[in-house]
Interface confidence: low
């Protein structure tokens, strides 16, 4: 999916108001310095591409993020503010239902969510500092 035509300010607002807090809740008890950020993004569409990938694509050692509160809210924000996004996710959703639903918060998942926090911070980078 090409995220170029999303309403970035609306997605930013959704992140600031709720998704960010859910990410913090998920990471509670983890030191902010525990994981190094190894994933980055270089513009807003690119950030959303990486955020979608880390949030919804199962990876080795962490297959359970898609059911988390921050993930569901992320999916809702993308569906609302990115034209045509919902249609591209139908097949992905069907595949997701076939995976195990057992929820396990592994260290790998914590590391992955730490990367997500970094990507979201990059997405929300201010244009200019406030005077």
């Amino acid at each position: 999916y090409d995220f170029t035509n999303c309403d970035f300010e609306k997605i930013k607002a959704a992140y600031l108001s709720t998704i960010s807090k859910d990410l913090i809740t998920y990471m509670s008890g983890t030191k902010s310095t525990e994981f190094n950020n190894t994933v980055s993004c270089s513009n807003r569409p690119h950030c959303l591409t990486e955020i979608q990938s880390l949030t919804f694509n199962p990876t080795a050692g962490c297959a359970s993020l898609a059911k988390e509160m921050f993930a569901m809210k992320t999916k809702a924000a993308l569906a609302i503010w990115c034209p045509g996004y919902s249609e591209t996710q139908i097949n992905a959703t069907q595949a997701m239902k076939k995976r195990r639903k057992r929820k396990v918060t592994t260290n790998k998942c914590l590391e992955q969510v730490s990367q997500l926090q970094g990507l979201w911070r990059r997405f929300n980078r201010p244009l200019l500092k406030q005077q």
Epitope: N43, H46, R125, L127, L128, K129
Partner: antibody, heavy 122, light 108 residues
Framework: QMQLVESGGGVVQPGRSLTLSCAAS????????MHWVRQAPGKGLEWVGV????????HYADSVKGRFTITRDNSKNTLNLQMNSLRAEDTAVYYC???????????????WGQGTMVTVSS | SYVLTQPPSVSVAPGETATITCGGA??????VHWYQQKPGQAPVLVIY???DRPSRIPERFSGSNIGNTATLTISDVEAGDEADYYC???????????FGGGTKLTVL
């Protein structure tokens, strides 16, 4: 590894044209804004211009506006600088530079090529 | 257009702290980046967004930006730090990128 390699430099007469190229590798070229920065012999750095990550916009320093044109081919990971009506004061090392693209924002130049020398002389 | 002013040169003994300034009108309201350039080499980013450090840059390098002056500080200076240092900002009024004139750091 991430790399930018410039080519096309050389000696050219005043008023003539020259095209510099930059080959990018090791990173997602199509997601980055790309700049040209130059440095005259013994002088400081001077920003030349930028092209947005998707090629939709370009911006130039006043000193080269109307004479220089930046283009890119994201399918080939290449950046070009077309320099017309060259002047002696355009003599410099030209660097191809990468910067994250945030829609006209103040991002740092986080990856530089090794530079290519352009000499404008009769 | 926006102007950045740097001292042409700064000298410091090994092990001491070097301070390089970059002056500009209300520069504290802008994001400042610093580059190191050694003779015959391309510049390297050493500080971005006023005070952030790329992962490969030693902790000895730090930055600050307030009021009309941005500052690059290099503590426990080594001979290998000898180079030209440039500050840079984005001028949003003209949509151009501006470099300071550069400061030559000499390690005595």
């Amino acid at each position: 590894q991430m790399q930018l390699v410039e080519s096309g430099g050389g000696v050219v007469q005043p008023g003539r044209s020259l095209t510099l190229s930059c080959a990018a590798s090791g990173f997602a070229f199509r997601t980055y804004g790309m700049h040209w920065v130059r440095q005259a012999p013994g002088k400081g750095l001077e920003w030349v211009g930028v092209i947005w990550y998707d090629g939709s916009a370009t911006h130039y320093a006043d000193s080269v506006k109307g004479r220089f044109t930046i283009t890119r081919d994201n399918s080939k990971n290449t950046l070009n600088l077309q320099m017309n009506s060259l002047r002696a004061e355009d003599t410099a090392v030209y660097y191809c530079v990468r910067a994250p693209q945030w829609y006209l924002t103040a991002e740092a130049f986080d990856l530089w090529g090794q530079g290519t020398m352009v000499t404008v002389s009769s | 257009s926006y102007v950045l002013t740097q001292p042409p040169s700064v000298s410091v003994a090994p092990g001491e702290t070097a301070t390089i300034t970059c002056g500009g009108a209300l520069i504290g309201s802008r994001l400042v980046h610093w580059y190191q350039q050694k003779p015959g080499q391309a510049p390297v980013l050493v500080i971005y967004d006023d005070s952030d450090r790329p992962s490969r840059i030693p902790e000895r390098f730090s930055g600050s930006n307030i009021g009309n002056t941005a500052t690059l500080t290099i503590s426990d200076v080594e001979a290998g730090d000898e180079a030209d240092y440039y500050c840079q900002v984005w001028d949003h009024s003209s949509n151009t990128y501006v470099f300071g004139g550069g400061t030559k750091l000499t390690v005595l």
